[in-house]
Interface confidence: medium
């Protein structure tokens, strides 16, 4: 999936399986990514687990879990708030669009999370105070915590290089783990550009991600995924000057 | 990544020592600390296979759970945190002590916090 980190780095990660997105004293978020097509290096998020840890007199520990075709509007125990404590309503789940869009607000830690199902896959966005991000007992052990550290260099796909290649087949071939084609050949580059331009008129990294995803998969739903990801940034990012990211902010290989 | 069992141990030691000691008449607190500990060991299980300290912790938890009649399910305890205010700071004076001002607990401590964003989407 495409990752925008807490430090506004933008990466395309091929990480497969379960990976921690966030891990601190209050909140633990883990994603499971699966290949979008057989033989493809590109992966998308198929499962998301969010643990709100027990917090003082406010909330009991609550676990939220979403999977492909299952975006519940409740925690795994069936509740929609923080439990039986007096401050339970400082943690709330709201269903915005049934089966497609959920918002979780954890007021006690000033945090808002948006989870969506777009097509078959999930998207995740969070707004969280730096103070909460930094609330960790063991900095040395934070390891591969994607929102903070980004994904390891050997797990990154340099998708911006694909964008400079105007031939769709070139992009598809680069995205594949083997030479086998990974997406229908019927999706030319020009069509991908047109589809993405429709929803994302600014040629930023969200637009480029959209083009990459269409060329890689042929699945038009990824256009919406990029569009909603940018909409969520508009709602959640505190710096309105940083809504759009452009090529110069990307991680260079070896950095 | 390394086995994180010591993190679990030290969190448990911190939660159950000194002024945080589980009083014998306050078994729910102790059980909550044990459940947190058990959860911590489960999270690090994958990286701790074959680690004697890990297996010792798991057996120790089982012993203590049965000794103190703790149920496997129930509330967990909050590890002592250093960054946000302690529980006392998140309560404002009120005529109704039942009302918890958890909505204010964060903002009260840091009037205008610096927010940060992370997002994951697409492939």
């Amino acid at each position: 999936p495409h990752l925008r980190t807490f430090t506004d780095r933008f990466q395309t990660c091929k990480v497969q399986g379960a990976w921690p997105l966030i891990d601190n004293n209050y909140l633990n978020v883990q994603v499971t990514n699966t290949p979008v097509l057989p033989g493809s290096a590109a992966t998308a998020t198929s499962k998301l687990t969010i643990i709100f840890k027990n917090f003082q007199e406010c909330v009991d520990q609550k676990v939220y879990q979403a999977e492909m075709d299952e975006l519940p509007a409740a925690f795994v125990d069936g509740s929609k708030n923080g439990g039986d404590k007096h401050g339970a309503n400082s943690l709330k789940i709201t269903e915005k669009v049934s089966g497609q869009h959920v918002e979780i607000r954890a007021k006690y830690i000033g945090t808002t999370i948006v989870v969506r199902q777009v097509g078959r896959y999930l998207t995740f966005a969070v707004r969280v105070p730096e103070e909460v991000v930094n609330a960790v007992e063991d900095w040395d052990s934070q390891g591969l915590y994607l929102c903070l550290r980004g994904c390891p260099l050997n797990q990154q796909i340099d998708f911006q290089a694909f964008h400079t290649n105007t031939e769709g087949t070139g992009a598809r071939r680069l995205a594949a783990a083997s030479p086998a084609p990974t997406a229908p050949e019927t999706f030319p580059y020009e069509t991908a550009v047109a589809k993405c331009k429709e929803k994302l008129p600014v040629e930023d990294l969200y637009y480029q991600a959209c083009v990459f995803d269409l060329l890689t998969t042929g699945d038009v739903n990824f256009t919406l995924a990029a569009y909603y990801a940018l909409e969520d940034v508009k709602m959640l990012h505190s710096n309105k000057d940083k809504l759009h990211l452009y090529e110069r902010t990307r991680d260079l290989p070896g950095r | 990544s390394p086995c994180k069992i010591l993190k679990c141990n030290s969190e448990f030691w911190s939660a159950t020592s000194g002024s945080h000691a589980p009083a014998s008449d306050d078994t729910p607190e102790f059980c909550a600390a044990l459940r947190s500990y058990a959860l911590c060991t489960r999270r690090t299980a994958r990286t701790c296979r074959g680690d004697l300290a890990y297996h010792s912790a798991v057996h120790g938890i089982e012993d203590l759970m049965s000794q103190h009649n703790c149920s496997k399910d129930g509330p967990t305890s909050q590890p002592r945190l250093h960054t946000l205010p302690p529980a006392g700071d998140s309560q404002e004076r009120s005529d109704s002590p039942e009302i918890c001002h958890c909505e204010k607990s964060f903002h009260k401590h840091s009037a205008t916090p610096n927010y940060t964003h992370c997002g994951l989407f697409g492939d």
Epitope: - | P2, L6, N9, S17, A21, A53, I61
Partner: antibody
Framework: EVQLVQSGAEVKKPGASVKVSCKAS????????ISWVRQAPGQGLDWMGW????????NYAQKLQGRVTMTTDTSTSTAYMELSSLRSEDTAVYYC?????????????WGQGTLVTVSS | QSALTQPRSVSGSPGQSVTISCTGT?????????VSWYQQHPGKAPKLMLY???KRPSGVPDRFSGSKSGNTASLTISGLQAEDEADYYC?????????FGGGTKVTVL
Amino acid sequence: EVQLVQSGAEVKKPGASVKVSCKASGYTFTSHGISWVRQAPGQGLDWMGWISPYSGNTNYAQKLQGRVTMTTDTSTSTAYMELSSLRSEDTAVYYCARVGSGPYYYMDVWGQGTLVTVSS
Amino acid sequence: QSALTQPRSVSGSPGQSVTISCTGTSSSVGDSIYVSWYQQHPGKAPKLMLYDVTKRPSGVPDRFSGSKSGNTASLTISGLQAEDEADYYCFSYAGTDTLFGGGTKVTVL
């Protein structure tokens, strides 16, 4: 075999600092805490504090707060205890000990001890 | 700092039983799962004999046993042997109020 091997004896002047090392072997260093305990000549044992090699978290005895610093180097599986502003009553044998595994806090393996003499 | 009080010395003949007490407060002993006992021979490092009040590490003979009643923990050596002559210390982990008892000299007559 699980072992803790400590550095050699030290003689220091009052006001100086001393740093004692404790090299661990035979087990996963980051899976156990390290405690430091001292024993003045003819006296009992005195707990100084502990450190988590895994995280660097420490817990010091109240009376030593501000004077003691415990650190670890996981690359060499070595723990260090530094005591500053030494006074004559700090003359003691200093032991490092591994904190036992599992939920119970106890010290199951001990170093051989390092004699620190503070004398003008 | 609260203290853990031990008798200065106890003695017994070979084969006899001796008990060493360790009295503290409710937080240091009464409610603690962290009481342990250490044996120290002259000029040597301490050795763990019991932890969690009653648990014996491997290698420690079963003639060493522990118990707790109220705010007092006890170490009992049954069938005393010559090599048991040593100093014994109780220990309680209680955060920043962690402490050893003053020590008990066990003499085998």
